[in-house]
């Protein structure tokens, strides 16, 4: 799985077990969602390409007091090579587009599933 995603590699590439755990966590979030996730908090949309893990963390780290995504935030920090703090933004953010956390998680989940499949069947 060293070249997961080819040229759009979301580097650094997490090992398949770690990626699988992140996907499982996102699945749990989407399945267990009763009330609006994180009270309907809005986050910056991101480009799901290279550097995606750091960008996702930069976006989600600005959501505070939402226990549902705390584990996801921790897992993403393990995939991002640099320290991320609130208010930090990379070029991967679509700065004019904000979406609900629930939609952000769904989009991220779909993309990670695709990356996982690509890694398995290479």
């Amino acid at each position: 799985l060293t070249c997961l995603g080819g040229f759009a590699s979301p580097g650094p590439v997490p090992p398949s077990t770690a990626l699988r755990e992140l996907i499982e966590e996102l699945v749990n979030i989407t399945q267990n969602q009763k009330a609006p996730l994180c009270n309907g908090s809005m986050v910056w949309s991101i480009n799901l390409t290279a550097g995606m893990y750091c960008a996702a963390l930069e976006s989600l780290i600005n959501v505070s007091g939402c226990s549902a995504i705390e584990k996801t935030q921790r897992m993403l920090s393990g995939f991002c090579p640099h320290k991320v703090s609130a208010g930090q933004f990379s070029s991967l953010h679509v700065r004019d587009t904000k979406i609900e956390v629930a939609q952000f998680v769904k989009d991220l989940l779909l993309h990670l599933k695709k990356l996982f499949r690509e890694g398995q069947f290479n």
């Epitope: 077990t17 699988r20 599933k113 695709k114 996982f116 499949r117 690509e118 398995q120 069947f121 290479n122």
Partner: antibody, heavy 120, light 107 residues
Framework: EVQLVQSGAEVKKPGATVKISCKAS????????MHWVKQAPGKGLEWIGG????????ASNQKFKGKATLTADKSTSTAYMELSSLRSEDTAVYYC?????FGGGPFAYWGQGTLVTVSS | DIQMTQSPSSLSASVGDRVTITCKAS??????LSWFQQKPGKAPKSLIY???RLVDGVPSRFSGSGSGTDFTLTISSLQPEDFATYYC?????????FGGGTKVEIK
């Protein structure tokens, strides 16, 4: 409703090649991996291999390397398995099976099976 | 390759009985295990995935448990339509491997 519809039974001579199809409907074809499973008469289930329909990337059981070739046509939502150099031990029912690895498992949905008989 | 050892290979039971089938993996499979039911001349049907999650539409008398290398399929109260052959499958890593099957027959 997810459906996997396989092509009909085949009778082939030893040494021949057969190509089985599996047409998927009820979901986005490229969202789930597609696998193929062999069941010889009176025997258990054996994984042949799988394909990611989005990329065409494959994974296969070493036992079937050189025997089974897996392909997928996104335009028709159809997966194919070609079996070459057929021998009597290739006589079996072959199933295609698909699903969401994380939501039901990769073998959640099954085709009805295609019986391939190899006989001279 | 990961070996899946299923036991027993066959069993006889009566309607209403509690039935337990086990599957042992040759290494830790991280609970990436499914159970299937197959009736003669039919395709297998998925019952359980991820070791303990019931597939939509499957009766609640079916349950899965276990972790690591040891897994169990339980039918709490056997019904006439449950007489069939059951298989486990590990999908933790390629090549995916099935157990040898357990035929549940009428006593």
């Amino acid at each position: 409703e997810v459906q996997l519809v396989q092509s009909g039974a085949e009778v082939k001579k030893p040494g021949a090649t057969v190509k089985i199809s599996c047409k998927a409907s009820g979901y986005t074809f490229t969202d789930y991996e597609m696998h193929w499973v062999k069941q010889a008469p009176g025997k258990g289930l054996e994984w042949i291999g799988g394909i990611d329909p989005e990329t065409g990337g494959t994974a296969s059981n070493q036992k079937f390397k050189g025997k089974a070739t897996l392909t997928a046509d996104k335009s028709t939502s159809t997966a194919y398995m070609e079996l070459s150099s057929l021998r009597s031990e290739d006589t079996a029912v072959y199933y295609c099976t698909s699903g969401d690895y994380f939501g039901g498992g990769p073998f959640a949905y099954w085709g009805q099976g295609t019986l391939v008989t190899v006989s001279s | 390759d990961i070996q899946m050892t299923q036991s027993p290979s066959s069993l006889s039971a009566s309607v209403g009985d509690r039935v337990t089938i086990t599957c042992k993996a040759s290494q830790d499979i991280n609970s990436y295990l499914s159970w299937f039911q197959q009736k003669p001349g039919k395709a297998p049907k998925s019952l359980i995935y991820r070791a303990n999650r019931l597939v939509d539409g499957v009766p609640s008398r079916f349950s899965g448990s276990g972790s690591g290398t040891d897994f169990t399929l339980t039918i709490s109260s056997l019904q006439p339509e449950d007489f069939a052959t059951y298989y486990c499958l590990q999908y933790d890593e390629f090549p995916y491997t099935f157990g040898g099957g357990t035929k549940v027959e009428i006593k």
